[in-house]
């Protein structure tokens, strides 16, 4: 028996070869002897039943001259899995067709962190092995059900599942979209008074995007978190539902989700969590956003630089007179200089690779008041 593997919804070609390599009489039948199609000597394809009943079955007329009389089955169904008989030259060739199907659980659009289950449907009597490869090259293998927990952004794309049966294989391609923000976390460094822009780009594109979202904010100085804004998303159009009075955030009307805080103030420094619930999806998308605010001030004879917000303990806060060595540098959130000399002072927040934030303050001779550029 020859074995042919097929994929549901696609086409399969069942071989039948003549030893004489020329056109001859042939008939394809089901195992119960019902005739499917054949050629009885006039070079004309004769179907065994009504056209509607047999419109999925065909042969390759162009191959007949070479002694090849394949049975083509289009739009394969799982129930096409059976034995087919080709009769020619007083002999019978049996061809076994096994149709397989690989499907993804419920939906091919899944939230980051959710599980993907790939299920193999196979004909009775078959014992296939299956291996699936993710777009980033991760291999999973097992029985008829394969699961991947904690889907990540890199899992978006075409998954290739290879079904192996009796040394023959058939390949399935399934497009999976992982719904997530492009970044899990971001941090914004701002001087006091500057406008703050928060952007939440999505890592996927879909025709219609509908849902609702909210930004919760935990200010460093506050004892509890607070909802800063809630919004709706309808077909990629953003509409604000509710916004706090302080701060009064503004939100862009189009994607990517974009929030503007009119002024960076110490009382706003902290961490936020933007959640987005999508229509017909269980669970939510999350992006963390952090705000660090710097303030440089001069009061009487004291020049002070402070930062608020979630900073790494490795960050260095420095005060220096322009073009001079730092007067003070500490891995702390506040530094100061007593009796600073006149000139342009710089407050710098830096790490091993760069200056993250800089604020300048002009110290005037002692009889004047300070000027902040």
């Amino acid at each position: 028996k020859t074995l042919v593997l097929g994929k549901e919804g696609e086409s399969a070609e069942l071989p039948c070869e003549s030893s004489q390599k020329k056109i001859t009489v042939f008939t394809w039948k089901f195992s119960d002897q019902r005739k499917i199609l054949g050629q009885h000597g006039k070079g004309v394809l004769i179907r065994g039943g009504s056209p509607s009943q047999f419109d999925r079955f065909d042969s390759k007329k162009g191959a007949w001259e070479k002694g090849s009389f394949p049975l083509i089955i289009n739009k394969l169904k799982m129930e096409d899995s059976q034995t087919y008989i080709c009769e020619l030259e007083n002999r019978k060739e049996e061809v076994e067709l096994w149709v397989f199907k690989v499907t993804a659980n419920s939906d091919t659009h899944l939230l980051q962190g959710q599980s993907l289950t790939l299920t193999l449907e196979s004909p009775p009597g078959s014992s296939p092995s299956v291996q699936c490869r993710s777009p980033r090259g991760k291999n999973i293998q097992g029985g008829k059900t394969l699961s991947v927990s904690q889907l990540e952004l890199q899992d978006s794309g075409t998954w290739t599942c290879t079904v192996l049966q009796n040394q023959k294989k058939v390949e399935f391609k399934i497009d999976i979209v992982v719904l997530a923000f492009q970044k899990a976390s971001s941090i914004v460094y701002k001087k006091e008074g500057e406008q703050v822009e928060f952007s939440f780009p999505l890592a996927f594109t879909v025709e219609k995007l509908t849902g609702s979202g909210e930004l919760w904010w935990q200010a460093e100085r506050a004892s509890s978190s607070k909802s800063w804004i809630t919004f709706d998303l309808k077909n990629k159009e953003v509409s604000v539902k509710r916004v706090t009075q302080d701060p009064k955030l503004q939100m862009g009307k189009k994607l990517p989700l974009h929030l503007t805080l009119p002024q960076a103030l110490p009382q706003y420094a902290g961490s936020g969590n933007l959640t987005l619930a999508l229509e017909a999806k269980t669970g939510k998308l999350h992006q963390e956003v952090n705000l660090v605010v710097m303030r440089a001030t001069q009061l009487q004879k004291n020049l002070t630089c402070e930062v608020w917000g979630p900073t790494s303990p490795k960050l260095m806060l420095s005060l220096k007179l322009e073009n001079k060595e730092a007067k003070v540098s500490k891995r702390e959130k506040a530094v100061w200089v007593l009796n600073p000399e006149a000139g342009m002072w710089q407050c710098l927040l830096s790490d091993s690779g760069q200056v993250l934030l800089e604020s300048n303050i002009k110290v005037l001779p002692t009889w004047s008041t300070p000027v902040q550029p």
Epitope: S186, S312, K314, M316, G353, Q354, L356
Partner: antibody, heavy 122, light 107 residues
């Protein structure tokens, strides 16, 4: 391509000094913090020191504090480790490594040299 | 200083196995942890940074998780080239400190 090449290793007596160099190429050296990491024979990795991109800040492991000095010359794209009062336990392969710092949040050593061997023995 | 305790110190496994290595910090280091792989006579190689971020070019069978004091490196399906020594490194604060290493050997 991005490369770090250590040199200056050798055999030295206890109490003596040695200076290691690390030549950087293929990237903007002055934009990165740089580390020294060592590994004693058959042992694990031990972090030694870091110097910031502009040389303004230096931090050391307790085991080398006061004896080793990390420095850099950005005009020569070179990192140094001055090792004084060497001890037998300083015997190790010394690696230099580049630190990537992103947003003051993500940190990692992505490029390493092949290492230079220092043997402290009488 | 922050101490890093890595376990196990050695581990025997077979190709195709799922392997987990853990690292515990003596104090909260948020997500300031990286994982490095080292083969005999070679320099260490970065695998994962800031707890869960896969370094470019590193196979996706490597993944990291955790937060605070407990962290995990997982290799989903061991390949022959994965037999090496693995180190965690806390880069949350100075001085940086490595775990003592986990030697992954062929069973």
């Amino acid at each position: 391509q991005v490369q770090l090449v250590e040199s200056g290793g050798g055999v030295v007596q206890p109490g003596r000094a040695l200076r290691l160099s690390c030549a950087a190429s293929g990237f903007t050296f002055s934009s990165y913090g740089m580390h020294w990491v060592r590994q004693a024979p058959g042992k694990g990795l031990e972090w030694v020191a870091i110097i910031w991109y502009d040389g303004s800040n230096k931090y050391y492991a307790d085991s080398v504090k006061g004896r080793f000095t990390i420095s850099r010359d950005n005009s020569k794209n070179t990192l140094y480790l001055q090792m004084n009062s060497l001890r037998a336990e300083d015997t190790a392969v010394y690696y230099c490594a580049r630190e990537v710092a992103l947003e003051g949040y993500y940190y990692y050593m992505d490029v390493w040299g092949k290492g230079t061997t220092v043997t402290v023995s009488s | 200083d922050i101490q890093m305790t890595q376990s196990p110190s050695s581990l025997s496994a077979s190709v195709g196995d799922r392997v987990t290595i853990t690292c515990r910090a003596s104090q909260d280091i948020r997500n300031g942890l990286g994982w490095y792989q080292q083969k005999p006579g070679k320099a260490p190689k970065l695998l994962i940074y800031t707890t869960s971020n896969l370094q470019s070019g590193v196979p996706s069978r490597f993944s990291g998780s955790g937060s605070g004091t407990d962290f995990t490196l997982t290799i989903s399906s061991l390949q022959p080239e994965d037999f090496a020594t693995y180190y965690c490194l806390q880069d949350y604060n100075y001085p940086y400190t490595f775990g003592q290493g986990t030697k992954l050997e062929i069973k």
